[in-house]
Amino acid sequence: GDMLIQKTIKKEVVLEEGTIAFKNWVKTGTEIYRQFWIFDVQNPQEVMMNSSNIQVKQRGPYTYRVRFLAKENITQDPKDNTVSFLQPNGAIFEPSLSVGTEADNFTVLNLAVAAASHIYPNPFVQVVLNSLINKSKSSMFQVRTLRELLWGYTDPFLSLVPYPVSTRVGMFYPYNNTADGVYKVFNGKDSISKVAIIDTYKGKRNLSYWESYCDMINGTDAASFPPFVEKSQVLQFFSSDICRSIYAVFESDVNLKGIPVYRFVLPSKAFASPVQNPDNHCFCTEKIISKNCTSYGVLDISKCKEGKPVYISLPHFLYASPDVSETIDGLNPNEEEHRTYLDIEPITGFTLQFAKRLQVNLLVKPSNKIQVLKRLKRNYIVPILWLNETGTIGDEKAKMFRSQVTGKIN
C-alpha cells in the first residue's frame, strides 16, 4: 500500500510532460488574486513644512487577478535534470472584488523625488534636481490614481532630467507584458527530493544583492516543495518580489476542503535584526537607517531596485522595531491579517492555499539642497501600499485531490 502510493507520488510530482504536477505547474489551476491597500497620506503639508509624523489611512482592497498566464519558454535539460522557464506577469483588475476603481485618487509620496534625492546624493547635482523639481511643480507628495501608482505614469520632474533616465515611474512598473526569470529548477527525475528546487535564477546561483549566504537562491518558488514534507522541516523558498530567499516553519494542522494540510508561516525571527538573530547579519547593508543594524522588520532592497530606496516589510510594519514606525501614524499591525502563510499538502508537497503579504515602503531623507525636502528633520520609511496575494485550491480540484491522494492514503 504505502510503497505503491510513494511510487505513484514520486512519479506524479516530477516536472515533465504527462504528470499531474507538470500540468498544474505550467498553468496553475488555482485562481490567484492580489489585493492592494494604498496608504493615503492625510497631512502632506504638515509633513513637508513641519516634519510632522505622516498620518496614513489605508484604502482597499483593490483586487487584481494575477499569475493566470502559463509559463513560457519551458525547456527540459536531460543532462542535469532541470527545466527552465519564464513566469509571465499579468494583472487584470477585478471591480467586483474592489472598493473602488483604478481611477481612484491617492495622496502618496512623490516616488521620483524621493528616489532621485537618494540616487544622486551629490549636493551640486541635488541643487540641479531642486531646479527641475520646482520647474515641474513637483512636491514631496503627489496625487495619483491607483492605475498610475501601481502600473506607471510619466513623471513631470523626471521628464526634465537631462540625463538618460526612464521617465516612467510606478510601484510595479513595468509589469504587464514582462516576465520573471529565467528560472531553472530541478525536475525531480533523478532525485524527487530536489523537485522544484531552483538551480539558477537569471542564469546564476546567487543574486549579487547581498553578502555571504544571504545572497544564495535557496529552495523552490513556494508554489510547491519536494514531497513528503515533515513538520520539523524548515521550508526554504526564493521570492523575487523581496529579492531574497526566506523560510517558513510549521505552525499548525489545517483542514482545507477536506484535505489535511500543514500550515507553514514566516516566523518573526526571519525579520529580526542581527542582534536578535545573527543569521540575518548579511541582510543589513547599511548602518545609518538601520541604526547600526539594530532596527528590524524592514529590508533595504535598493540594490535590487536600481538604487531606488525601496524597503520591504510586512504590512503595517508587523514584526518591525518601534523606531521604524515612530514617524507614521495610523498603522495597526495584526498577525492574523498581516503575516504570510503557506498551506502545504505534505504528501505531494503542493501548496494548496497561501497568503503572501508584504508592504512596499520608500525611504525619504532630508536634503538641504532640495526645497521640498529641506524642512524635514528626520528620515522617514514611508509606507506606500501593502498587498495580499492569495490562492486557494478550487472545489473541483480539491475533490480530485481528495479522491486521488488523501483518500487513497486514508
Partner: antibody, heavy 116, light 107 residues
Framework: QVQLQQPGAELVKPGASVKLSCKAS????????MHWVKQRPGQGLEWIGE????????NYNQKFKGKATLTVDKSSSTAYMQLSSLTSEDSAVYYC?????????WGQGTTLTVSS | DIVLTQSQKFMSTSVGDRVSVTCKAS??????VAWYQQKPGQSPKALIY???YRYSGVPDRFTGSGSGTDFTLTISNVQSEDLAEYFC?????????FGAGTKLELK
Amino acid sequence: QVQLQQPGAELVKPGASVKLSCKASGYTFTSYWMHWVKQRPGQGLEWIGEIDPSDSHANYNQKFKGKATLTVDKSSSTAYMQLSSLTSEDSAVYYCAPIHYGLDNWGQGTTLTVSS
Amino acid sequence: DIVLTQSQKFMSTSVGDRVSVTCKASQNVGTNVAWYQQKPGQSPKALIYSASYRYSGVPDRFTGSGSGTDFTLTISNVQSEDLAEYFCQQYNSYPLTFGAGTKLELK
C-alpha cells in the same frame, strides 16, 4: 528667457564695503539656487558660494567666509553679495548664475575696482 | 579642496583641426565635471555637464570624455568662433573648483 541684470562696474575705496546686485527675470526666482563666481583679470574662476532664495540659506567657500555675504530680496527677485574690508585683491569681475541644469546661465558680471 | 590642472595654458590650432583640451583632478571626481567656454569680455558659456553630456544648443563638434581624474574636451573641425578660453569645473564636492583655463588661439 532667463535674464540676469548686473551693474557693469563699481569703483570703491580700500577698506570699504560694496553690495553687488543681480536682478533675475524670466524664471521663478525662489525656485533656483543662485551661485556667485569671482574672476580676476587674466586669471581663472573661483566659486564664492550659493544661496537658496526660498529661505536665504547660504553655503560659502571657506576662503570667502567673512569676506562675502549672500542675501536675496524675494519681492524684487534680486540676489545680493556684500563684500567687506575691500583690498586690491578683491578687484575682479563677479558673476551671478542661477542653477537650472547646471551653471548654464551667467550674468554679464560686475567689474569691481578697488582703488584709492 | 580639489585642484583641477589644465596643463596647457595656450593651444595653437587651425580652422578645421581637431584639438583636445585636458583637465586633471587632484582626486577622483567621478564624472562630476563641466566645461565652459569664455570669449574676451563675455561671461562663461556652459558646454558640457557630467563629463560627456552636451548642453542643448551646443554644436556636436564639442565632445567631453573621461572619468575619475582625467578629462578631455575635444573640438573636432575647429571653427573661428571656437577661439576662446576653456575652463573645466568639478562639482563632485564643495567648494566647487575650476581649472585655470586653456586659451585656444590661431597658429
